[in-house]
């Protein structure tokens, strides 16, 4: 029986040219994680983290994707084309496959600075990464 829970970064926005953490976390299961796949909205693989072999970043993303923190990915030098869905797929034994979804919206710098739609009060942040000023969650 699959008892696990996947938590994700959720819906986030980030500034063009900046970076963002894509993160998933599997809990509530004793299953062993054998591999984590990271896919983009068009189903192309960004990276794979195999429990035995470690990380493999696909050539098309080598310059802009850094492994970690943890089993997550850091997407750098963001472009408007990076807007869209991202998926983490946890391959586990004996449970099987768990899948999490993240939606990233990349904003033009001026929009990111001034758009009220994504602004969260400075003491009301619900994200955590290396440059919190430029990353916002929206529901």
């Amino acid at each position: 029986m699959m008892t696990g829970t996947i938590e994700t970064t959720g819906n986030i926005s980030a500034k063009k040219g900046g970076s963002v953490i894509l993160q998933c976390h599997l809990s509530s299961t004793m299953a062993q994680v054998t591999q984590v796949n990271w896919e983009q909205h068009d189903h192309s693989l960004l990276a794979i983290r195999n429990a035995e072999l470690g990380w493999h970043i696909y050539p098309a993303f080598k310059d802009r994707v850094a492994p970690g923190p943890g089993l997550g990915l850091t997407l750098q030098s963001l472009t408007m084309n990076d807007t869209g869905e991202y998926f983490c797929t946890y391959h586990t034994y004996p449970d099987g496959t768990y899948r999490g979804r993240i939606f990233l919206e990349v904003l033009e710098s001026s929009v990111a600075e001034h758009s009220a739609r994504f602004q969260i009060p400075i003491e009301g942040r619900d994200y955590k990464d290396d440059d919190d000023k430029h990353h916002h969650h929206h529901h």
Epitope: G10, P69, G72
Partner: antibody, heavy 123, light 112 residues
């Protein structure tokens, strides 16, 4: 096995300084944000400060802002709290705590706590 | 900042009887990933706090199934189906959605 061991507490006069340390082991230290939480006499748990996995994001409770400084050394798997201009109301048992989820999701709570180090501020 | 309000602050219970603690947040704890970030902690006398329940209703590893959590948005409840002597201590709810993190005032469970 995850372990968090605090040290550095003691008796100090008001206005003086103290530096707390927390030595961590048993998990990928540089993938998680860490916190300081305190338990004062006759009071409940009070959150003090948080530092992100790479020190890029730091937050403090209003009660300690401008007086306390949180830092970490990922090479040494260590967390610190520099406490300046101490007040009697800072008297408490100080715990370091590990976030439950790795960087990028949200605070998500604390799955492991240290045993605490006692800070007593008195003249 | 999010304010957490717990009730009751004191809870005398007879062993074997059920117990319930309420927790209310001043704003929604719903994250964009669909989860409500509400935790319950228990601090037993002379011990370090321990995580009991996270994401409103998920029991932490090793927590007995007599503990259960429920609720959504701003109203949450911790239930103990049958209180045991070892449950004595202070129960705290905490919002884990954002900083500054905030705890409820704590509910002291005592055995009658």
């Amino acid at each position: 096995e995850v372990q968090l061991v605090e040290s550095g507490g003691g008796l100090v006069q008001p206005g003086r300084s103290l530096r707390l340390s927390c030595a961590a082991s048993g998990f990928t230290f540089d993938a998680y944000a860490l916190h300081w939480v305190r338990l004062g006499p006759g009071r409940g748990l009070e959150w003090v400060s948080r530092i992100s996995w790479n020190s890029g994001s730091i937050d403090y409770a209003d009660s300690v802002k401008g007086r306390f400084t949180i830092s970490r050394d990922n090479a040494k798997n260590s967390l610190y709290l520099q406490m300046n201009s101490l007040r009697t109301e800072d008297t408490a048992l100080y715990y370091c705590a590990k976030e439950r989820t790795p960087a990028g999701i949200t605070v998500a709570g604390f799955d492991f706590w240290g045993q605490g180090t006692l800070v007593t501020v008195s003249s | 900042d999010i304010v957490m309000t717990q009730s009751p602050l004191s809870l005398p219970v007879t062993p074997g009887e059920p117990a319930s603690i309420s927790c209310r947040s001043s704003q929604s704890l719903l994250h964009s990933n669909g989860f409500n970030y509400l935790d319950w902690y228990l601090q037993k006398p002379g011990q370090t706090p321990q995580l009991l329940i996270y994401l409103v209703s998920t029991r932490a590893s090793g927590v007995p199934d007599r503990f259960s959590g429920s609720g959504s948005g701003t109203d949450f409840t911790l239930k103990i189906s049958r209180v045991e002597a070892e449950d004595v201590g202070v129960f705290y709810c905490m919002q884990a959605l954002q900083t500054p993190c905030s705890f409820g005032q704590g509910t002291k469970l005592e055995i009658k």
